[in-house]
Amino acid sequence: EQVKHSETYCMFQDKKYRVGERWHPYLEPYGLVYCVNCICSENGNVLCSRVRCPNVHCLSPVHIPHLCCPRCPDSLPPVNNKVTSKSCEYNGTTYQHGELFVAEGLFQNRQPNQCTQCSCSEGNVYCGLKTCPKLTCAFPVSVPDSCCRVCRGDGELSWEHSDGDIFRQPANREARHSYHRSHYDPPPSRQAGGLSRFPGARSHRGALMDSQQASGTIVQIVINNKHKHGQVCVSNGKTYSHGESWHPNLRAFGIVECVLCTCNVTKQECKKIHCPNRYPCKYPQKIDGKCCKVCPGKKAKELPGQSFDNKGYFCGEETMPVYESVFMEDGETTRKIALETERPPQVEVHVWTIRKGILQHFHIEKISKRMFEELPHFKLVTRTTLSQWKIFTEGEAQISQMCSSRVCRTELEDLVKVLYLERSEKGHC
């Protein structure tokens, strides 16, 4: 029986999904199967089906690994001689960079005067709840650049967004040229949304999910990584080298301060910045260009490659020390990653035993700080945030399964990199 307290949900491979939630299943040995969409139906059943691919208008479409639908080769002469930016694939439909579209049924808490605006920017789909201006005319009209309807002659809408606006990656998509919904329609009764549950930093199309839907900005991003040459990332026409960070600049929303993108070799990895619930001062202030409030008069003390303030915060989020120990004996490598926390005061040690590249044993132990201090071989490698640790542990769960049945050489080392907090661009978060 799957109904509890009149709240229906679905179970798929030991994970819980809300009614209306959609995701790509994670299936061995392929990983995320992008050609299959699953949805949690009202009766608690999961329905999965193959993505229907749109017709491509070229003679020899190419099939790119990790993308479902074939597409026209990038080498084709661009239409109208415009420089082509990275497009977005969503639900079997390709959107061009800068293209805006409307999604329905995404937000449970959509107000009657709000609509869902989605935008494709450099391969990422961003959706936001847009608060529409009050209409003063009887017959408002739709405009191409907004999900809100406007009065004739009102001119172009500004794209300011209030603190209460919510962004989300879409789960379902209205027909590309559908008639925009009136913002006085009742909000949709069913909630959709949600992404494949896979840590963003390690997947080809990462999902960054915010669990607590509190006030402020909720961000979900899907990253389509096409193969690029050279050790750089290109975003919004700008080139970033490995390790550089920036805030995405979206045509629809301007600079999104609460999302930080980092160039990891050639992959753009974006994540939501979590602001702390408590600050070390009584009256933190909101500063232009920063996502989180800051305490006045505090100068940030910088560690190599990382930006922390004197209370051990990184971009407003508390940080904790990460230790590592690597011990080799009789052809067996024991690698330990440890996170020291204050609440509760303990050390969480993740132990990996690897022989000839195959994972022999993986376990987690929680020990007191005193006990930890007596353990040999550990050295401090970085400080990290709880949100990065969460991404690390999710990725760890995936690769612990994967590496027990096949040879893994760099997977764990690559995953540990998630814990390193890069210095953000110009010291901004």
Partner: antibody, heavy 118, light 107 residues
Framework: QVQLQQSGAELVKPGASVKLSCKAS????????IHWVKQRSGQGLEWIGW????????KYNEKFRDKATLTADKSSSTVYMELSRLTSEDSAVYFC???????????WGQGTSVTVSS | DIVMTQSHKFMSTSVGDRVSITCKAS??????VAWYQQKPGQSPKLLIY???TRHTGVPDRFTGSGSGTDYTLTISSVQAEDLALYYC?????????FGGGTKLEIK
């Protein structure tokens, strides 16, 4: 076009081993998993396991873990299944099949008949 | 292991009839179900996957449906060439398992 060509019929003695092959063509060998399925005469289908040339990942049905060994040769785009300590219970037709990226066994080999008899 | 049960070992039908072959899983398999057709002396041939997606080249008289534990393969108008063995298979969890098969025969 996609093809899976399996080796010819085998007549083997009890206790011996046999190595069946499945040669893939018409697609990128390392991108798809090859599965093996057993069918005894007049009976249903039983899944033995898979080999994924892309990563070397192997998954066995526990029932066949001590019976079958899956290997591959990337240079010839061939997956092998070795059956050991054969008994009359192992007399069957063995099929190899390709698992598409969207999780469908879309192409099958013609099958290899193995007869265990003294 | 998940057990896939095809309750009818044989089904008699006439050309032009509509026929439904059923398959029941011992637990929820979340539409991770495929249907195969096998003719004597041949390899199985994929018809339907993910419970309802018709494989390329399969005539549209074949449709798949179902969710949870109950799945159905329907042939809307049986043709002579459809007389064969039909197997359902789950790929929700390993070991992947097949139903015992349903043989479609002419009355």
């Amino acid at each position: 076009q996609v093809q899976l060509q399996q080796s010819g019929a085998e007549l083997v003695k009890p206790g011996a081993s046999v190595k069946l092959s499945c040669k893939a063509s018409g697609y990128t060998f390392t991108e798809y998993t090859i599965h093996w399925v057993k069918q005894r005469s007049g009976q249903g289908l039983e899944w033995i396991g898979w080999f994924y040339p892309g990563s070397g990942s192997i998954k066995y049905n526990e029932k066949f873990r001590d019976k079958a060994t899956l290997t591959a040769d990337k240079s010839s785009s061939t997956v092998y299944m070795e059956l050991s300590r054969l008994t009359s219970e192992d007399s069957a037709v063995y099929f190899c099949a390709r698992l598409d990226r969207d999780y469908a066994m879309d192409y099958w080999g013609q099958g290899t008949s193995v007869t265990v008899s003294s | 292991d998940i057990v896939m049960t095809q309750s009818h070992k044989f089904m008699s039908t006439s050309v032009g009839d509509r026929v439904s072959i059923t398959c029941k899983a011992s637990q929820d398999v979340s539409t991770a179900v495929a249907w195969y057709q096998q003719k004597p002396g041949q390899s199985p041939k994929l018809l339907i996957y993910w419970a309802s997606t018709r494989h390329t080249g399969v005539p549209d008289r074949f449709t798949g449906s179902g969710s949870g534990t109950d799945y159905t393969l329907t042939i809307s108008s049986v043709q002579a060439e459809d007389l064969a063995l039909y197997y359902c298979q789950q790929h929700y969890s390993t070991p992947w398992t097949f139903g015992g098969g349903t043989k479609l025969e002419i009355k």
